[in-house]
């Protein structure tokens, strides 16, 4: 089938990194600078993505694959393929409509993105606060007074808070 197809369409013989040049009797010409073709048989090469400004080049464009962008320091990627850069804040802050603001008392953020979350309420689990929370860190819950017996030390750190479902670009 491939052989038949290539007899009918000479362009199908053009590999990735080239295009089928109609102006040159359907010869396979290499993609011009700053363009690529990721599949064979293409009649044009696509322009390479340019990572400038808040976008930064993570992977250079080649004749067969597009460039990949990430974000400059102080920003992080949002969207598939890093189609958006969002401002980072410091730990202990959250991004609001007025910019980065410190977490309110009783809340924390241990990352440079995301929102401030309430400290763990140790008493809900019948435990006491072993280490106080800060803007950057959750409280550490310790055993309840009734649990305290000689040699007992069951310190329970809260579950690690992480950005759900986000994998770095």
């Amino acid at each position: 089938f491939e052989r038949t197809r290539s007899l009918q369409d000479p362009c199908s013989n053009c590999p990735a990194g080239t295009f089928c040049d109609n102006n040159r009797n359907q010869i396979c010409s290499p993609c011009p600078p700053n363009s690529f073709s990721s599949a064979g048989g293409q009649r044009t090469c696509d322009i390479c993505r340019q990572c400038k400004g808040v976008f930064r080049t993570r992977k250079e464009c080649s004749s067969t694959s597009n460039a990949e962008c990430d974000c400059t320091p102080g920003f992080h990627c949002l969207g598939a393929g890093c189609s958006m850069c969002e401002q980072d804040c410091k730990q202990g802050q959250e991004l609001t409509k007025k910019g980065c603001k410190d977490c309110c008392f009783g809340t924390f953020n241990d990352q440079k993105r995301g929102i401030c979350r309430p400290w763990t309420n140790c008493s809900l689990d019948g435990k006491s606060v072993l280490v106080n929370g800060t803007k950057e860190r959750d409280v550490v819950c310790g055993p309840s007074p009734a649990d305290l017996s000689p040699g007992a030390s069951s310190v329970t750190p809260p579950a690690p808070a992480r950005e759900p479902g986000h994998s770095p670009q």
Partner: antibody, heavy 116, light 107 residues
Framework: DVQLQESGPGLVKPSQSLSLTCTVT?????????WNWIRQFPGNRLEWMGY???????SYNPSLKSRISITRDTSKNQFFLQLNSVTTEDTATYFC?????????WGQGTSVTVSS | DIVMTQSHKFMSTSEGDRVSITCKAS??????VAWYQQKPGQSPKLLIY???TRHTGVPDRFRGSGSGTDYTLTISSVQAEDLALYFC?????????FGGGTKLEIK
């Protein structure tokens, strides 16, 4: 498949607040991406209003900053638009959309008229 | 804000023709440009992002090109179902802005 559906009142009085809900099915709004509101005015002009990201941070169009708030209810997989002090200039079709490969999934839109 | 200008509000073409819709940004948007198609009574549908990357399921007759401030959406062989409104959008910096739209009419 990811689906978004806008809901809310079709008529709002001037100076009141406009409140809309976007219900997302087929994808958790806390998993990834940014969840946006866009509006289309009579005459077809589109305006990006703002988003709430999967992590809960927000970004707004500066032209609306003093009037807009985007929030969410993760238990219901919904996000919300509140636009305060509306005027007849806010009459538009309001869309919610996911910013994945840019604005890759949109709701059908809900028409809002501001009139007394 | 970055202003995206689509100079043609209407374009008339025939089935099978090649048509190019242009969009000009008020400053360099570094290929961070998307194109959307909106049919009457429907929401916009993503066609192209990063200036030339076709979104999943978009027919290969749609092609995006351009860099700097000048961008083009080309439909190589117009079909009747391509009758629609086409918008460009920059996704370089907030606020993300759209062009005014170009309505493609079939003769």
């Amino acid at each position: 498949d990811v689906q978004l559906q806008e809901s809310g009142p079709g008529l709002v009085k001037p100076s009141q607040s406009l409140s809309l809900t976007c219900t997302v099915t087929g994808y958790s709004i806390t998993s990834d991406y940014a969840w946006n509101w866009i509006r289309q005015f009579p005459g077809n002009r589109l305006e990006w209003m703002g988003y709430i990201s999967y992590s809960g941070s927000t970004s707004y169009n500066p032209s609306l900053k003093s009037r807009i708030s985007i929030t969410r209810d993760t238990s219901k997989n919904q996000f919300f638009l509140q636009l305060n002090s509306v005027t007849t200039e806010d009459t538009a079709t309001y869309f919610c959309a996911r910013w994945g490969y840019v604005l890759d999934y949109w709701g059908q839109g809900t028409s809002v008229t501001v009139s007394s | 804000d970055i202003v995206m200008t689509q100079s043609h509000k209407f374009m008339s073409t025939s089935e099978g023709d090649r048509v190019s819709i242009t969009c000009k940004a008020s400053q360099d948007v570094s290929t961070a440009v998307a194109w959307y198609q909106q049919k009457p009574g429907q929401s916009p549908k993503l066609l192209i992002y990063w200036a030339s990357t076709r979104h999943t399921g978009v027919p290969d007759r749609f092609r995006g090109s351009g860099s700097g401030t000048d961008y083009t959406l080309t439909i190589s062989s117009v079909q009747a179902e391509d009758l629609a409104l086409y918008f460009c959008q920059q996704h370089y910096f907030t606020p993300y802005t759209f062009g005014g739209g170009t309505k493609l009419e079939i003769k």
